[in-house]
């Protein structure tokens, strides 16, 4: 706590600006003017504040808001949004798009702290889903967002989001993820071709059931190994040799530099040694 | 890993301008850091002279302020000091250095340092 | 400015033997910083926001303090210790470092 001093003579801020650098912290705190520094926090960033001196701005902002920052001040806070802890962050009604992009610029190129990660949840409850706009937000800064979630959280997702989701995105999902978004993907995706439909389902295929698979199997997909790889070890089992050779097509041959690992070994044992021995690959059911 | 340079000549004569380079690998300049420039003289006293922000702003110790310049590169990734009117005062190991937060507090990653000689 | 006057100057201890150094303030801080110097060497970062050790830094080191008062303390000495140790502030501008604790080995 910053203790209270009276301002010297002179001294009292007329404004935010580099002149405040110099200023002791009992200096900040006596002679700059709370309701000042929320009108003009979108100078704050500009200005070379030290890690203390940013203290000193927080606590004043602290007392004239005991209940939450309004909106107008949170997207302007820029670094002081660092100095915040989740709890300061919970008081807080973040609606605006823009509001979230500026903070998460703030902290770009760091890993998820707690404070961004309250932040997100505060504002995906506010909205009450994660929509399109949102999710292409959140996945921009942190491509490993959506696998951060819960498969609980991920239900309330909409289809019309999914399109947002690229690839990587989903490179940290674990299967009970993916049983929840999979779904979602082929509703989303359901009107599109064959081809254009494998581009876009296919890295959520970790979630697809076996009836989805054998159906695959019939369009000339041609699934690469690191996608068969990812399958649901359950799903796959069903599929017969000729359904899987289908399905991977060209890539066929890959199975036998995965012949010890899940779910091609457990596949393998599943099947007939005269129905593998027809791919020709030297597999031993 | 963050790795800092300095270069530039080890002898300068009084009256002139000592100009050093420092070279960053690891990081970029423009990230979010400041870029600093610190000098240790002979006898082991340490003096922040500047330092060059990342959006290429500045801010100088009030003793030097009318004698130094701090500029960058960013394509370079290099970060530059000018001290101009030099005199045997200015004789110092001269480091460069980047800040270990998002605000001005402490002085995470440093040079080995340069030493430059102020003498006729 | 802020000036730093550290204490004592120049010390020496056995290994073993816990050390510990000061760093007096003339105005009030939150936070200090610490760095270790051997000859020859770039300062190293030891311990930042007053008592967080630095990446790399061996755990018998430690920082404690607040207000004008702060000190460096190491629980054990070895060898490898002897160094100059400066403590810095950037509390306000221009950030100013300590002059120096040079702990000898005995």
């Known amino acids: 706590e910053v203790e209270k001093t009276a301002c010297p003579s002179g001294k009292k801020a007329p404004e935010i600006d580099e002149s405040l650098i110099f200023y002791k912290k009992w200096e900040l705190e006596a002679c700059v003017d709370a309701a000042l520094l929320a009108t003009q926090m979108d100078r704050v960033n500009a200005i070379p504040f030290t890690y203390e001196q940013l203290d000193v701005l927080k606590h004043k902002l602290d007392e004239l808001y005991p209940q939450g920052y309004p909106e107008s001040v949170i997207q302007h806070l820029g670094y002081l949004f660092l100095k915040m802890s989740p709890e300061d962050i919970r008081k807080w009604n973040v609606t605006s798009l823009e509001t979230l992009k500026a903070l998460l610029e703030v902290n770009k190129g760091h890993e998820m702290s707690p404070q961004v990660a309250t932040l997100i949840d505060r504002f995906v409850k506010g909205r009450g889903q994660l929509d399109k706009d949102t999710l292409d937000t959140l996945t921009a800064f942190y491509p490993g967002y959506l696998c951060s979630l819960s498969p609980e959280e991920l239900s309330s997702v909409p289809p019309s989001s999914i399109w947002a989701v690229r690839p990587q995105d989903l490179d940290t999902c674990d299967p009970r993820q993916l049983d929840v978004l999979y779904p979602k993907a082929r509703l989303a995706f359901q009107n599109m071709n064959g081809s254009e439909y494998f581009v876009k389902i296919q890295s959520f295929l970790g979630g697809a059931p076996t009836e989805d698979l054998k159906a695959l199997s019939q369009q000339n997909v041609s699934m690469d190994l690191a996608t068969f790889m990812k399958l649901r070890t359950d799903a796959v089992l069903p599929l017969t040799v000729a359904e899987v050779q289908k399905l991977l097509g060209p890539h066929v041959e890959g199975l036998k530099a995965e012949e010890r690992h899940r779910p091609v070994r457990d596949w393998i044992l599943r099947q007939r040694q005269d129905d593998l021995d027809t791919l020709g690959l030297g597999l031993q059911g | 890993d963050v790795q800092l340079q300095e270069s530039g000549p080890g002898l300068v004569k009084p009256s002139q301008s000592l100009s050093l380079t420092c070279s960053v690998t690891?990081?970029?300049?423009?990230?979010?850091?400041?870029w600093n420039w610190i000098r240790q003289f002979p006898g082991n006293k340490l003096e922040w002279m500047g330092f060059?922000?990342?959006?290429?702003?500045?801010n100088y110790n009030p003793s030097l302020k009318n004698r130094i310049s701090i500029t960058r590169d960013t394509s370079k990734n290099q970060f530059f000091l000018k001290l101009n009117s030099v005199t045997t005062e200015d004789t110092a190991t001269y480091y460069c250095a980047r800040e270990g937060s998002y605000a001005p507090a402490w002085f995470a990653y440093w040079g080995q340092g340069t030493l430059v000689t102020v003498s006729a | 400015q802020i000036v730093l006057t550290q204490s004592p100057a120049i010390m020496s201890a056995s290994p073993g033997e816990k050390v510990t150094m000061t760093c007096s303030a003339s105005?009030?801080?939150?936070?200090m910083y610490w760095y270790q110097q051997k000859p020859g060497s770039s300062p190293r970062l030891l311990i930042y926001d007053t008592s967080n050790l630095a990446s790399g830094v061996p755990v018998r080191f430690s920082g404690s303090g607040s207000g004008t008062s702060y000190s460096l303390t190491i629980s054990r000495m070895e060898a490898e210790d002897a160094a100059t140790y400066y403590c810095?502030?950037?509390?306000?501008?221009?950030?100013?470092f300590g002059g120096g604790t040079k702990l000898e080995i005995k």
């Open positions: 105005s009030s801080l939150s936070y």
């Open positions: 690891g990081d970029s300049i423009t990230s979010g850091y400041y």
């Open positions: 810095q502030q950037w509390s306000s501008y221009p950030p100013t």
């Open positions: 060059i922000r990342f959006d290429g702003t500045n």
